[in-house]
């Protein structure tokens, strides 16, 4: 459910939301670290109704949720990290 991507693309998020989404309605979370053409960290949430939203990384709820997911994944499977080579 938690994915970290390193990409050479520019920022993916045009606008960000702080609105709470309970984990039960989240399909997966994609984290795009700052850099490689985008000056800010981005968090993209895929919801179970097939819609996608960019979430403000400063939103308290997403920070809490990612902490829970990190703890959970460290006790089971490692968080998948997908690295794209920068040309």
């Amino acid at each position: 459910v938690l994915e970290v991507y390193y990409t050479s693309l520019r920022c993916r998020c045009v606008q960000e939301s702080s609105v709470f989404i309970p984990r039960r309605f989240i399909d997966r979370i994609q984290i795009l670290p700052r850099g490689n053409g985008c000056p800010r960290k981005e968090i993209i949430v895929w919801k179970k109704n097939k819609s996608i939203v960019c979430v403000d990384p400063q939103a308290e709820w997403i920070q809490r949720m990612m902490e829970v997911l990190r703890k959970r994944s460290s006790s089971t499977l490692p968080v998948p990290v997908f690295k794209r080579k920068i040309p």
Epitope: V19, F20, R23, R24, F25, K48, S51, E60, W61, R64
Partner: antibody, heavy 123, light 106 residues
């Protein structure tokens, strides 16, 4: 005091449609997501639909997806369930329930429920 | 989809008895389980959420425990008003209710 009052149930033929309503009071309706849960006669509880506090997001289980539509009117403190292409297996008491607090970050489940309205699908 | 297997489906007990109901999830649901009480002709009432957190006003004789896939709901000393049907609900991944446990007077 939180109150949820369902209405709109009744007898409908297979293939027919029905619209259920739920009037909410005693809390800030626009701050909470809302859900519908049903219970077939003598059976257990089954989740039917959930809508976010602002009404922009809706979620359904596969067995009602495409047939049922949940909606809300925050100005009227009202929740709705439009049910189309009804089948005999949709016969149940339908409850509306208050769901998570949308302005927070707590993973709370449905806490307050109405008394339900009976929907009977039969020819 | 997550399946919730609740057992037993029915249970006979006496006032003062200690009663335990279990729910097993088909996959890890962390601690995202709730327990409801339902009396005939009435709406379900939330007793416990997040495995063990009691709702305000719910007597302390009700308790819950577990994590991952195995969860337990306990009534430490049955009171006459406790005879009802109890349901578990997982809310880690959408919603799934257990099949219910009907608690009857012996």
């Amino acid at each position: 005091e939180v109150q949820l009052v369902e209405s709109g149930g009744g007898l409908v033929q297979p293939g027919g449609s029905l619209r259920l309503s739920c009037a909410a009071s005693g809390f800030t309706f626009s701050s909470y997501a809302m859900s519908w849960v049903r219970q077939a006669p003598g059976k257990g509880l089954e989740w039917v639909a959930t809508i976010s506090e602002g009404g922009s997001d809706a979620y359904y289980p596969d067995n009602v997806k495409g047939r049922f539509t949940i909606s809300r009117d925050n100005a009227k403190n009202s929740l709705y369930l439009q049910m189309n292409s009804l089948r005999a297996e949709d016969t149940a008491v339908y409850y509306c329930a208050r769901d998570y607090y949308g302005s927070g970050y707590e993973e709370s489940p449905m806490d307050y429920w109405g008394q339900g309205t009976l929907v009977t699908v039969s020819s | 989809d997550i399946q919730m297997t609740q057992s037993p489906s029915s249970l006979s007990a006496s006032v003062g008895d200690r009663v335990t109901i279990t729910c097993k999830a088909s996959q890890d649901i962390n601690k995202y389980i709730a327990w409801y009480q339902q009396k005939p002709g009435k709406a379900p009432k939330l007793l416990i959420h997040y495995t063990s957190t009691l709702q305000p006003g719910v007597p302390s004789r009700f308790s819950g425990s577990g994590s991952g896939t195995d969860f337990t709901f306990t009534i430490s000393s049955l009171q006459p008003e406790d005879f009802a049907t109890y349901y578990c609900l997982q809310y880690d991944n959408l919603y799934t209710f257990g099949g219910g446990t009907k608690l009857e007077i012996k």
